[in-house]
């Protein structure tokens, strides 16, 4: 799993737009039935918030035990609390399930800070507000953890939706979504609409509010506006993509595009922030500082350590720039851009000292493991994880937070040459060099 500020939280070459638009996603060749349209039963099936994660209700075992499970596109294990823990209201009780099967194998997952470990087994799993199917899936029963579960988050497990290559203990442990597709007629795709509130939510408000939608097996048109634009999944491990250009308020950061993807760029619903490689982060912050220079902020704010507050309702969104990421398109030499607002990258936080002021954390941070397009990016967009066609789609989310002057955007096409050069090739460890 990605290091750094991941949930569970502990705490390019651009060019002129082409004259012709590429075909809209819906104009492409027909797709298998049941793949698109309306998925009323799945709309609004997520709750939560960017700082603590978005979760879906799932049932495990026979008779079914209901648990809230964090939706994480940055990992590949289905793992649930299976022993008492101070932060868990409930947990999976294997001994009460007649369909539980023990795999007699342990699993240990360390993070930069914290870890979880558990015992592998399989059981019957379903998603009440998902497709009407039950699957036998691998489950890691978490028996011990450190800084994994979050007090007050209201989730008891994690649903890793990425590929088998990054599953623990190894890629032979089939991830939940692979099992789902293999055992049912559910198409090999899911889509996420994460809805940031735009203001801090206390625990009871999170429980009462809708956090978004996970549409399993399809695309729901009511969840986005405009067109869906697709970027190829570079490699099926994380949901890896290629960023070809970055702009702050329309100003190109002018870095070698390899830097944007060093050592990878991934789409990860289990990370709060937009995380950028060190060099890119420094250039981006310098540019954002320059753009918002009517007011000076302390270094601690840009490092995500200090909150900045304005009197209620007076946040000057207009002094902060928009950020555009250009992604490799599906057509040779074609890219598109996704643009987020400060309403996405300034994350509302409840400050203990005051209730009448609006306080924010800067939700862009530094990474040593590449770019992570976390919840603050995803909250601007409806994101389609089209595994069947090895691509990820972005459209403007119908629930994104904006103001009367600016809105998040997905626009294209743009002419961009040599985009393949933007990908970084992680050196493979040569086993032979390790022999002595």
């Amino acid at each position: 799993t990605q290091h750094g500020i991941r949930l569970p939280l502990r705490s390019g070459l651009g060019g002129a737009p082409l004259g012709l638009r590429l075909p809209r996603e819906t104009d492409e060749e027909p797709e298998e039935p049941g793949r698109r349209g309306s998925f009323v039963e799945m709309v609004d099936n997520l709750r939560g918030k960017s700082g603590q994660g978005y979760y879906v209700e799932m049932t495990v075992g026979s008779p079914p035990q209901t648990l809230n499970i964090l939706v994480d596109t940055g990992s590949s294990n289905f793992a649930v609390g299976a022993a008492p823990h101070p932060f868990l209201h409930r947990y999976y009780q294997r001994q009460l399930s007649s369909t539980y099967r023990d795999l007699r194998k342990g699993v240990y997952v360390p993070y930069t800070q914290g870890k979880w470990e558990g015992e592998l087994g399989t059981d019957l799993v379903s998603i009440p507000h998902g497709p009407n199917v039950t699957v036998r899936a691998n489950i890691a029963a978490i028996t011990e953890s450190d800084k994994f579960f979050i007090n007050g988050s209201n989730w008891e497990g994690i649903l890793g939706l990425a590929y088998a290559e990054i599953a623990r203990p190894d890629d032979s442990l089939e991830p939940f979504f692979d099992s789902l597709v293999k055992q049912t007629h559910v198409p090999n795709l899911f889509s996420l609409q994460l809805c940031g509130a735009g203001f801090p939510l206390n625990q009871s408000e999170v429980l009462a509010s809708v956090g978004g939608s996970m549409i399993i097996g399809g695309i729901d048109h009511s969840l986005y506006t405009g067109s869906l634009w697709y970027t190829p999944i570079r490699r099926e491990w994380y949901y890896e993509v290629i960023i070809v250009r970055v702009e702050i308020n329309g100003q190109d950061l002018k870095m070698d595009c390899k830097e944007y993807n060093y050592d990878k760029s991934i789409v990860d619903s289990g990370t709060t922030n937009l995380r950028l490689p060190k060099k890119v982060f420094e250039a981006a912050v310098k540019s954002i500082k320059a753009a918002s220079s009517t007011e000076k902020f302390p270094d601690g704010f840009w490092l995500g350590e200090q909150l900045v507050c304005w009197q209620a309702g007076t946040t000057p969104w207009n002094i902060f720039p928009v950020i555009s990421l250009y992604l490799m398109g599906e057509v040779t030499n074609q890219s598109f851009r996704i643009t987020i607002l400060p309403q996405q990258y300034l994350r509302p936080v409840e400050d203990v000292a005051t209730s009448q002021d609006d306080c924010y954390k800067f939700a862009i941070s530094q990474s040593s493991t590449g770019t992570v397009m976390g919840a603050v990016i995803m909250e601007g967009f409806y994101v389609v994880f089209d595994r069947a066609r090895k691509r990820i789609g972005f459209a403007v989310s119908a629930c994104h937070v904006h103001d009367e002057f600016r809105t998040a955007a997905v626009e294209g096409p743009f002419v961009t040459l040599d985009m393949e050069d933007c990908g970084y090739n992680i050196p493979q460890t040569d086993e032979s060099t390790l022999m002595t």
Epitope: E295, G300, F301, C309, Q311
Partner: nanobody, 128 residues
């Protein structure tokens, strides 16, 4: 249009009192304060108030003698100056900032660099 309008300056004998007022318009400000500049010296922070949480910050040289306050509408800030000394002679400027930040120290609060909006200044002269 952003405006900070000071009033209340003047001449006074040592140990006397003055009350400065600053009325702000244009924005809602979180931090408002008073700074001063004596001839040939750098501009220095005197007192600052955080409208959001009511915190006040004072320079050591004025602690116990000066009091910063604001009216209920929060668009006017006052500096009550008692026990004035000749070394308090300076041009007094009202300054404002739209945001505040957690962990703000007195040094930061009284640093003119953090303030974006400034008044024209009002002269205070204290004679012995």
């Amino acid at each position: 249009d952003v405006q900070l309008q000071e009033s209340g300056g003047g001449s006074v004998q040592a140990e006397g009192s003055l009350r400065l007022s600053c009325t702000a318009s244009g924005y809602t400000y979180s931090l408002m304060g008073w700074f001063r500049q004596a001839p040939g010296k750098e501009r220095e922070g005197v007192a600052v108030i955080n409208s959001g949480v009511g915190t006040t910050y004072y320079a050591d040289s004025v602690k116990g003698r000066f009091t910063i306050s604001q009216d209920n509408a929060k668009s006017t800030v006052y500096l009550q100056m008692n026990s004035l000394k000749p070394e308090d002679t300076a041009i007094y400027y009202c300054a404002a900032r739209r945001s505040w930040f957690t962990g703000m120290t007195t040094t930061q609060a009284l640093d003119p660099d953090w303030f974006s909006y400034w008044g024209q200044g009002t002269q205070v002269t204290v004679s012995s």
